[in-house]
């Protein structure tokens, strides 16, 4: 038998905010005319399901967000590569659970400067996951999350705020001064931290 890695490598899910994309690389003997077909299934199911729109494709990614949309379920996907010469190789992912494996993007935040304070409003982060009634769930609906906010005052001093609410305000700031704010989503039960959202804002001049 030939080594499947010659045609196909690194089959894995890349998941951000519950958008689940299957990606892979061609092996050293893969060519631009190698075609790829994708199947997926849930834990313990016998039959693999062919993903429509990802059969005999030449690109090296396939969006499986809809097919892997139950965030309590375990999924697998597998890719079969077929070269122009008729050689084939199949590889599968490890078990994938979006609740556990998705990475969190930076939150969407509005930073509002005032004279002696900076207000930060965190907006709910939508996901592709839908509730029973069809509406899209936010990260807050899915996780017991909190927000961690930091304001860099100078090189040696930072102010910190945190909690589950969406509105925060750093008080006691100097007017007409630039500050760097960093806001992250934290999910302690899953040991997750989002990439940070950063805003550089200047407090308003004191006109009094």
């Amino acid at each position: 038998p030939e080594d499947p890695s010659d045609l196909l490598q690194h089959v894995k899910f890349q998941s951000n905010n519950f958008e689940n994309i299957l990606t892979w690389d061609s092996g050293p003997e893969g060519t631009p005319d190698t075609v790829y077909s994708i199947e997926y299934k849930t834990y313990g199911e016998r039959d693999w399901v062919a993903k429509k729109g990802c059969q005999r494709i030449t690109r090296k990614s396939c969006n499986l967000t809809v097919e892997t949309g139950n965030h309590t379920e375990l999924y697998y996907a597998r890719v079969t590569a077929v070269s122009a010469g008729g050689r084939s190789a199949t590889k599968m992912t490890d078990r994938f659970n979006s609740l556990q494996h998705t990475a969190l993007k930076p939150p969407d935040v509005t930073c509002i400067p005032k004279v002696r304070s900076i207000q930060m409003i965190v907006h709910p982060t939508p996901t592709p996951i839908r509730a029973g009634d069809g509406h899209r769930l936010t990260l807050e609906d899915i996780y017991d999350l909190s927000y961690h906010l930091e304001l860099q005052v100078n090189r040696t001093y930072q102010m910190h705020l945190g909690g589950k609410q969406r509105e925060y305000e750093f008080f006691g700031l100097t007017p007409d001064t630039e500050f760097l704010g960093t806001i992250m989503i934290c999910v302690p039960t899953w040991s997750k931290k989002s990439a940070p959202y950063m805003c550089r804002v200047r407090t308003l001049p004191d006109r009094t």
Epitope: P4, V11, K12, T42, Y43, G44, R46, N70, T72, E73, L74, Y76, R78, A89, T90, K91, M92, T93, D94, R95
Partner: antibody, heavy 116, light 113 residues
Framework: EVQLVESGGGLVQPGGSLRLSCAAS????????MNWVRQAPGKGLEWIGE????????TYNQKFKGRFTISVDQSKNTAYLQMNSLRAEDTAVYYC?????????WGQGTLVTVSS | DIVMTQSPDSLAVSLGERATINCKSS????????????LAWYQQKPGQPPKLLIY???SRESGVPDRFSGSGSGTDFTLTISSLQAEDVAVYYC?????????FGQGTKVEIK
Amino acid sequence: EVQLVESGGGLVQPGGSLRLSCAASGYSITAEYMNWVRQAPGKGLEWIGEINPSTGTTTYNQKFKGRFTISVDQSKNTAYLQMNSLRAEDTAVYYCARFDAYFDYWGQGTLVTVSS
Amino acid sequence: DIVMTQSPDSLAVSLGERATINCKSSQSLLYSSNQKNTLAWYQQKPGQPPKLLIYWASSRESGVPDRFSGSGSGTDFTLTISSLQAEDVAVYYCQQYYSYPFTFGQGTKVEIK
């Protein structure tokens, strides 16, 4: 037709090592999970662990972790069970079995006897 | 670890009669994602490897005669052979795949009376 064939069993002294092989045919070993299960003479079945042959990711029964190692050679379409520090109580028929939850195809098994 | 306990340890049934094997798990095997039970049944004849009969507690494996059926939910499960045939003489095992490590019952030996 899917077939699994184990080999490498035999008599080994206590404290010794053995490597069992499981040659898969009729499908690509990287297309499904592979497990090792053992059965002591006249006893029940005991799950040792599993491997995703595509990624090499393994999960073990804690009872065997550290002494037993599961691996795969994709180019040979073969899975392996490396067994170290063998004891008399490891005497059993060792099976490889396919799938990720329950086991749809089994090899015929290979007998390992640990005795001085 | 989830402990699987089968009863009886052995069973003698007349040809054509019903054989019932029970399997009890130390915790629920109901998988919340699909509301199915993560339990399989195997048949093992002397000198042979186990053969998959039933998965998801009640789904019959392809090629398995329909006299074999599985039922139950949660922690209590049953394998029924509706009309015992001579070729059904074997040891039967249940197995849970709810969590690691996967575990088996101790086996039930079915003989002809």
